[in-house]
């Protein structure tokens, strides 16, 4: 059984205020079964960015279709970047529990950063 | 507007409960950890506990086993269930709002705890 | 647990002048420092994270500085709404978050 890994490829992620900015995330493995979270930040105080089964993220999108049984993609969309959405991005895989979801294991991170806007 | 709002202080004796309460609104309450940080009178602030968006919970050791933390998000409020006070618990108890920094950027005006016989 | 002393505990400074404090943390903590206000009778106000990085609405005439383990907060020209006791707060060793004791600015 292939372990588990969470592949987020860009380390930075430099985007434009007003556009929207893609951070990608795909899995190697189905198992074990359990929701991807998307956060901002690490530590107690990381800030829920995504998250699939519940919450209001009116700026978030996926770019497949998470309820497909066999998805290997979590990459989300976030539109109308402004300088308050800089910092580090981790999907992270949770195992389903009972009664509570354990987290699992974290990507590495992509920083998104402001770029220099289009001359 | 950010707010946070805590009520439930007052006075109880040594060793009884109280349970205060934080309402939020003008943020995604789900979408934060929210924490308690407490101030006895006349001395500086002291982190008391957090609760993490996913529900972990963080206590510092002067509370450990006798204070409860817990959000209800349907609610957007936050919870601190209190037992077994000692004269050292009085303070004032404020909220707050932590960011992904893991700092507290939006608090609340507090609500005073008072235990004495 | 890291322990932040702050110093002076006290400091008398007329209005205009340049106030300087400092917080020095018993283990690094990196630039992982944020300072606080707080006025009487009020909650306390985040002014700087990061060691040196203005929360929102925060006026330029606050600044912070990092010298390894030893972190300044510098407010250029004090106004009156500047006289208040300031606390800095570890935000990279959690938990516990951890606050130093404080410094009172008071009017000279």
């Known amino acids: 059984e292939e372990e588990l890994q969470m592949i987020q490829p860009e380390k930075l992620l430099l985007v434009t205020v007003g556009k929207t900015a893609t951070l990608h995330c795909t899995v190697t493995s189905l198992l074990p079964v359990g929701p991807v979270l998307w956060f901002r930040g690490v530590g107690p105080g990381r800030e829920l960015i995504y998250n699939q089964k519940e919450g209001h993220f009116p700026r978030v999108t996926t770019v497949s279709d998470l309820t497909k049984r066999n998805n290997m993609d979590f990459s989300i969309r976030i539109s109308s970047i402004t300088p308050a959405d800089v910092g580090t991005y981790y999907c992270v895989k949770f195992r389903k529990g009972s009664p509570e979801n354990v987290e699992f294991k974290s990507g590495p991170g992509t920083e998104m950063a402001l770029g220099a806007k289009p001359s | 507007d950010v707010q946070l709002v805590e009520s439930g202080g007052g006075l109880v004796r040594p060793g009884e409960s109280l349970r205060l309460s934080c309402a939020a609104s003008g943020f995604t309450f789900t979408n934060y950890a929210v924490t308690w940080v407490r101030q006895a009178p006349g001395e500086g602030l002291e982190w008391v506990s957090l609760?993490?968006?996913?529900?972990?919970?963080y206590y510092a050791d002067s509370v450990k086993g006798r204070f409860t933390i817990s959000r209800d998000n349907s609610k957007s409020t936050l919870y601190l269930q209190m037992n077994g006070l000692r004269a050292e618990d009085t303070a004032v108890y404020y909220c707050?709002?932590?960011?992904?920094?893991?700092?507290?950027?939006?608090w609340g005006l507090g609500t005073l705890v008072t235990v004495s016989s | 647990e890291i322990v932040l002393t702050q110093s002076p505990g006290t400091l008398s400074v007329s209005p205009g002048e340049r106030a300087t404090f400092s917080c020095r943390a018993s283990q690094t903590v990196g630039s992982k420092l944020a300072w606080y206000q707080q006025k009487p009778g009020q909650a306390p106000r985040l002014l700087i994270y990061?060691?040196?990085t203005r929360a929102t609405g925060i006026p330029a005439r606050f600044s912070g500085s990092r010298s390894g383990t030893e972190f300044t907060l510098t407010i250029s020209s004090l106004q009156s709404e500047d006289f208040a006791v300031y606390y800095c707060q570890q935000h990279t060793d959690w938990p516990p978050y951890t606050f130093g004791g404080g410094t009172k600015v008071e009017i000279k």
């Open positions: 707050a709002k932590v960011t992904w920094k893991n700092v507290f950027d939006y």
């Open positions: 609760i993490s968006v996913t529900g972990t919970t």
């Open positions: 990061d060691a040196n």
